[in-house]
């Protein structure tokens, strides 16, 4: 009774095809699969950026898989052939491990990269990026991004620099079409002719670094004697109502009365008769049903109202503002 | 159910050109990598250069420079032009195919008999 044996997988590699991040694990089946031919082989892979503690692991009946690293580091992975149970008369067999391994032969030191990268995807529509030079570089450096998201055939280049003093110091993006709740790949090289420049690799996702616009149309409406409802709108643009928080500042007669955090375009504040003077203002940012993070917009302009009858002037604006 | 056919192989001189041709036909729903391996009796085959997902192309050791590796989809058929040809490039030149059958829901690998390219004076 002979013990079954599988050779690993052939061929196997990591092949970079310039999507600054996204790669392809690929491999071919082990030698000898004759005697299995009535078997469908399943190859257990795991991968990870040199650093990391964990492995992710993935398990296909495929010839390649493919996912996001992040190129600042090297990248290794792992692959063996499993025949299931089926096959082996009731245990699995695993293979030897064939291991490979990716980077990018970086150029450079470190201080030369970009400094500070910040972007920010404004109101969900116009995306813009922007950095420091890398320390002790001279004023021939240049620095040129580099985008890809799937659905692009190729990395495009930054059409639409921000310069100051004659370097690269920002991207403003064309529209994105299709291009949110997917990984966004950002490279951001340099030349200099006086020394090597190292890249930088970025990933995110658009739709949490979105910066929406202030909400507008503030107003107030007197509800009953000690109720007042503070009503704004969503700003003009895509973003739906249901992708909104919002945090909004209540000041009443020049002392803070309360900040509060609401999901709808309505907040109801209990008064007292006292009141001479309420202000309002309202900031948005998106919730978490449609990102994982996100950044609040500006304040809106303040919306005031003073004067002893504040409850006979709100009653007049609110029927103004229906009629 | 998967046949690929390879010819374009033969004698040539040293510093001359072949092009070699592998057409796939058969029941194969869609083509995902094509690449040429070569073989020398008693040693190991190498992968020679590829299109792999996104039409990426790679090419291994010597025949950086030297090869260009093509595709005619309509065709279903991938070209190895081979030039500046030298005695070490002298092999057995075998087609792959990693591609899903019609009747298949993963990835197969598909390899064609060989040419032999012999570079000789």
């Known amino acids: 009774d002979t013990e079954i044996k599988v050779n690993p997988p052939q061929d196997f590699e990591i092949v970079d095809p310039g999507y600054l991040g996204y790669l392809y694990l690929q491999w071919q089946p082990p030698l000898s699969l004759d005697h299995f031919k009535e078997c469908t082989v399943e190859y257990e892979l795991k991968y990870r950026n040199i650093g990391s503690e964990t492995w992710k692991t993935i398990i296909t009946k495929n010839l390649h898989y493919k996912d996001g690293f992040d190129l600042n580091k090297g990248i290794e992975a792992k692959i063996h052939t499993l025949l299931p149970w089926q096959c082996t008369n009731g245990s699995e067999v695993q293979s030897s491990w064939a291991e490979t391994t990716y980077w990018i032969s970086p150029q450079g030191i470190p201080e030369t990269k970009v400094q500070d990268m910040d972007c920010v995807y404004y109101n969900w529509q116009y995306l813009l990026c922007s950095w420091k030079p890398g320390i002790g570089v001279l004023l021939d450096t240049n620095y040129n991004l580099f985008y890809w998201y799937e659905g692009l055939d190729h990395a495009l280049q930054c059409v639409d620099y921000i310069k100051a003093d004659g370097q690269n110091i920002g991207c403003r993006f064309p529209y994105l079409e299709a291009s949110d709740y997917k990984d966004f790949y950002i490279c951001v090289n340099g030349s200099s002719e006086n020394k090597p420049i190292r890249s930088s690799y970025f990933t995110f996702q658009l739709q949490n670094i979105v910066k929406p616009l202030p909400p507008v149309y503030l107003t107030f409406t007197r509800e009953s004697s000690c109720e007042i409802k503070l009503k704004w709108s969503i700003p003009l643009g895509p973003i739906p109502a249901r992708c909104f928080d919002y945090e909004i500042e209540i000041r009443e007669d020049d002392t803070t009365l309360v900040t509060a955090t609401v999901e709808n375009e309505t907040y109801t504040l209990k008064t007292t008769n006292e009141t001479r003077q309420l202000c309002f203002v309202v900031r948005s940012k998106v919730n978490i049903y449609c990102s994982d993070d996100g950044i609040w917009s500006e304040w809106s302009d303040k919306q005031c109202w003073e004067g002893e009858d504040l409850s006979k002037k709100t009653l007049l604006r609110h029927h103004h503002h229906h009629h | 159910q998967v046949q690929l056919q390879e010819s374009g192989g033969g004698l040539v001189q040293p510093g001359g050109s072949l092009r070699l041709s592998c057409e796939v036909s058969?029941?194969?729903?869609?083509?995902?990598?094509m690449a040429w391996y070569r073989q020398v009796p008693g040693k190991e085959r190498e992968m020679v250069a590829q299109?792999?997902?996104?039409?990426?192309?790679k090419y291994y050791g010597s025949a950086k420079g030297r090869f260009t590796i093509s595709k005619d989809s309509a065709k279903n058929a991938v070209y190895l032009q081979m030039n500046s040809l030298k005695p070490e490039d002298t092999a057995v030149y075998r087609c792959?195919?990693?591609?899903?059958?019609?009747?298949?829901?993963?990835?197969?690998?598909?390899w064609g008999q060989g040419t032999q390219v012999t570079v000789s004076s």
């Open positions: 792959n195919i990693v591609g899903v059958l019609t009747t298949g829901h993963y990835e197969n690998s598909f």
């Open positions: 058969g029941s194969i729903s869609s083509i995902n990598r």
């Open positions: 299109i792999t997902y996104g039409d990426t192309i």
